[in-house]
């Protein structure tokens, strides 16, 4: 997992300065709110309700 | 280093009531969601209970299995997890683990304690 | 509820050979882009160990002998070559909605 300004996250993550960690993106399906889900690539799937 | 310590637990008759306690470090703790998943012989791994964020007022799921008799809680000043049990049950005998998950996966488990219902 | 149905429920593996562990779900758990599959590794007296995510994602610190593939319903974990050290019970858990579910493990063993 990388800091910000040196090499990006994986493929299918992104940075999360709220938890200081690469996030996957795969978990804004749950919480899209999450402030690395905006830095994912495609925007999340529809709303998800559990 | 993420660690989750468990108290409470051990032998208490049918109808009866425990309080489980975790209390977690290592991690931004209020920004995770906290469950409860037990363990037994018959019903393998179990979840039972989840509690979310204060952002969004401590929302809880429970499984039906429990739900009516346990009730899970937070202080997130004290980096800590409850379950209260009530009414408990001999089907309710097994390992209790609190573990956390962020939105999906349980990544980090306590190191389980036993409860056993009966008379 | 999304039923997972975990196979074999044991299974015997030579030193250095692949072990194969299937994991099936009752509904579909993956979107276009992700499934909502995970694995666990469990040793006696100790509580899960994470090891995959999202189906094929190995957390860090997990060896690359331990790999997860499949989308859909249908998912299986890989360990090859498999070591002593992996005598443990294996489990998958899904995501997909609540309640999240575990499988009814497989037992791997040496032989």
């Known amino acids: 997992e990388q800091a910000p300004g040196t090499a990006p996250c994986s493929r299918g993550s992104s940075w999360s300065a709220d938890l200081d960690k690469c996030m996957d993106c795969a978990a804004c399906r749950a919480r899209p709110h999450s402030d690395f889900c905006l830095g994912c690539a495609a925007a999340p799937p529809a709303p998800f309700r559990l | 280093e993420v660690k989750l310590q468990q108290s409470g637990g051990g032998l208490v008759q049918p109808g009866g009531s425990m309080k489980l306690s975790c209390v977690a470090s290592?991690?931004?703790?209020?920004?995770?969601?906290m469950n409860w998943v037990r363990q037994s012989p018959e019903q393998g791994l179990e979840w039972i209970a989840e509690?979310?964020?204060?952002?969004?007022?401590?929302?809880?799921h429970y499984a039906e299995s429990v739900k009516g008799r346990f009730t899970i809680s937070r202080d997130d000043s004290k980096n800590s997890v409850y379950l209260q049990m009530n009414n408990l049950r001999p089907e309710d005998t097994g390992i209790y683990y609190c573990a956390c998950r962020y939105a999906d996966y349980f990544d980090h488990w306590g190191q389980g304690t036993t409860l056993t219902v009966s008379s | 509820d999304t039923v997972l149905t975990q196979s074999p429920a044991s299974l015997v593996v030579s030193l250095g050979q692949r072990a194969t562990i299937s994991c099936r779900a009752s509904?579909?758990?993956?979107?276009?882009?992700?499934?909502?599959i995970h694995w666990y590794q469990q040793k006696p007296g100790q509580p899960p160990k994470f090891l995959i995510k999202y189906a094929s994602n190995r957390d860090s610190g997990v060896p690359a002998r331990f790999s997860g593939s499949g989308s859909g319903t249908d998912f299986t974990l890989n360990i090859h070559p498999v070591e002593e050290d992996d005598t443990a019970i294996y489990y998958c858990?899904?995501?997909?909605?609540?309640?999240?579910?575990f499988g009814a493990g497989t037992k791997l063993e040496l032989q």
């Open positions: 290592g991690f931004t703790f209020s920004y995770y969601w």
């Open positions: 509904q579909s758990v993956s979107t276009s882009d992700y499934s909502y």
């Open positions: 858990q899904h995501s997909w909605e609540i309640p999240p579910t």
């Open positions: 509690i979310r964020l204060q952002s969004n007022d401590y929302p809880t």
